[in-house]
């Protein structure tokens, strides 16, 4: 039960942040005007991946895509790329991952397939809120070096007899959706690779062994695995170690030491 | 058509207020930002400020804080120019004016108030 | 504040001549968000309100005559009315319409011979 729970909320998680890495990706506010301590103009202007806007007082906004691919900053083209990865993993990791779901049944499809499966979206779900993360923090590093840049040259001037109006550029709302939307991804991420722990098959097949003190009548247990009967019953393929400790996913009866063939 | 109703006039004593009002009709009236423009004869143009009707956010020109008040009355598309402690330098005439949409210019004019201070 | 400077002050020509008055300002009015300049001119006849020509440094107000053309970006500005008619008898103000508070120059008076 416990790792049904883990695996379906790790999903739930995931899903929710790769929804928000795609959302961030294009959103248009990913760095806006700063209006602290800066000359207030009618025009409030804000950037995005894609695009830049500008909106008027009277709340008129027009917005201007990239069209250049060379004249961009190499920066604003690896964020772009991080985010793009970010979302084509997780997309990939979601698609693995329902498939991989303990309470959807694929056929006959082995528990050791679903645990490997799960392990693999996990992976994914990782990678993918690491791009996002990523991909934040660079624009945002960015975004602070220019800010400081401007700062300076506000006040110091920039040795020409005309003034110009510096627009300095502070974090815009889909940083803060893309580091939230990450950190989601990652942690779901995480919580399918510990899914996967409680879905995989140990790797040695202990056979039960029944010892008698006589040393010679040895029984011994065949097929260490007992296979799932349907759904709704329990999925996992269980170990029997001296007669099977069971877990609390377990909901049938295993054989006791003293069961014998 | 946009159209903006100013009084012609208001004459007052020295260190009384005023309230000049500006009637729009023909358009949306909180959609637009509502400016006043002051003019002197033989001098140029000075703005007062600016309103936005839809939610009454304001834009002062830091030389007329404290002399100007700029208030609307979104039931009669009206907006509200109130002028205290006026002394003969407030004689002037004073246009309302509706910002574009489309840019912060000032699309449409009113006729304009002739404000006279003097006892 | 951004103070907005015109020249000439007044000028007088006759009708059918080509007219260019300026406008400078104390700083940059270019955006760089849009790469649109916030100059706006306006026209102001004896009696009347102003009215609106040019908005963003060169575009023409719907219903105002191409004869009226505005350009320049940055802090130089310039009207230009290629063939002066009697009706422009006028005062010419040039504004600041980015940075608040919004300032106007001092106008530039036309006078037809």
């Known amino acids: 039960m416990a790792v049904t729970a883990c695996q379906g909320l790790g999903f739930v998680v995931s899903l929710i942040g790769i929804a928000g890495i795609i959302a961030a990706t294009c959103m248009d506010q990913w760095s806006t005007q700063d209006l602290y301590n800066n000359p207030v103009t009618a025009v409030f202007n804000y950037q995005g991946l894609w695009r830049s806007c500008v909106r008027e007082s009277s709340g008129f906004t027009e917005c201007r895509g990239y069209f250049t691919l060379l004249g961009l900053p190499a920066m604003l083209q690896a964020v772009r790329a991080l985010m793009i990865v970010g979302i084509v993993l997780g997309a990939i990791g979601l698609l693995v991952s329902i498939f991989a779901l303990k309470c959807i049944r694929i056929g006959s499809m082995e528990d050791s397939a679903k645990a490997n499966m799960t392990l693999t979206s996990g992976i994914m779900f990782i990678v993918s809120g690491l791009c996002a993360i990523a991909g934040v923090s660079v624009f945002a590093n960015m975004l602070v070096t220019n800010f400081w840049m401007s700062t300076a040259n506000m006040y110091t001037g920039m040795g020409g007899m005309v003034q110009t109006v510096q627009t300095r550029y502070t974090f815009g709302a889909a940083l803060f959706v893309g580091w939230v939307a990450g950190g989601l991804t990652l942690i779901g991420g995480v919580m399918m690779c510990i899914a996967c722990r409680g879905l995989a098959p140990e790797e040695t097949n202990y056979k039960a062994v029944s010892y008698h003190a006589s040393g010679h009548s040895v029984a011994y247990k065949p097929g260490g695995f007992k296979a799932s009967t349907g759904f709704g019953s329990n999925t996992k393929n269980k170990k029997i170690y001296d007669g099977g400790a069971r877990t609390e996913d377990e909901v049938q009866s295993y054989p006791s030491k003293h069961d014998y063939v | 058509q946009v159209q903006l109703q100013q009084p012609g006039a208001e004459l007052v004593n020295p260190g009384a207020s005023v309230k000049v009002s500006c009637k729009a009709s023909?358009?949306?009236?909180?959609?637009?930002?509502m400016h006043w423009v002051k003019k002197r004869p033989g001098q140029g143009l000075e703005w007062i400020g600016g309103?936005?009707?839809?939610?009454?956010?304001?834009n002062y020109n830091h030389k007329f804080k404290g002399k100007a008040t700029l208030t609307v009355d979104k039931a009669s598309s009206t907006a509200y120019l109130q002028l205290s402690s006026l002394t003969s330098e407030d004689s002037a005439v004073y246009y309302c004016?509706?910002?574009?949409?489309?840019?912060?210019?000032?699309?449409?004019w009113g006729q304009g108030t002739v404000v006279t201070v003097s006892a | 504040d951004i103070v907005m400077t015109q020249s000439p002050s007044s000028l007088t020509v006759t009708a059918g001549e080509k007219v260019t008055m300026n406008c400078k300002s104390s700083?940059?009015?270019?955006?760089?968000?849009?790469?649109?300049?916030?100059v706006t001119w306006y026209q102001q006849k004896p009696g009347q309100p102003p009215k609106l020509l040019i908005f963003w440094a060169s575009t023409r107000e719907s219903g105002v005559p191409d004869r009226f053309t505005g350009s320049g970006s940055g802090t130089d500005f310039t009207l230009i009315i290629s063939s002066v008619q009697a009706e422009d008898l006028a005062v010419y103000y040039c504004q600041n319409d980015y940075v608040y508070p919004f300032t106007f120059g001092s106008g530039t008076k036309l006078e037809i011979k």
């Open positions: 004016a509706m910002g574009a949409y489309y840019s912060n210019s000032f699309a449409y």
């Open positions: 309103i936005r009707p839809s939610d009454s956010n304001n």
């Open positions: 023909g358009s949306t009236f909180t959609t637009y930002w």
């Open positions: 700083q940059s009015l270019l955006n760089r968000g849009n790469q649109k300049n916030y």
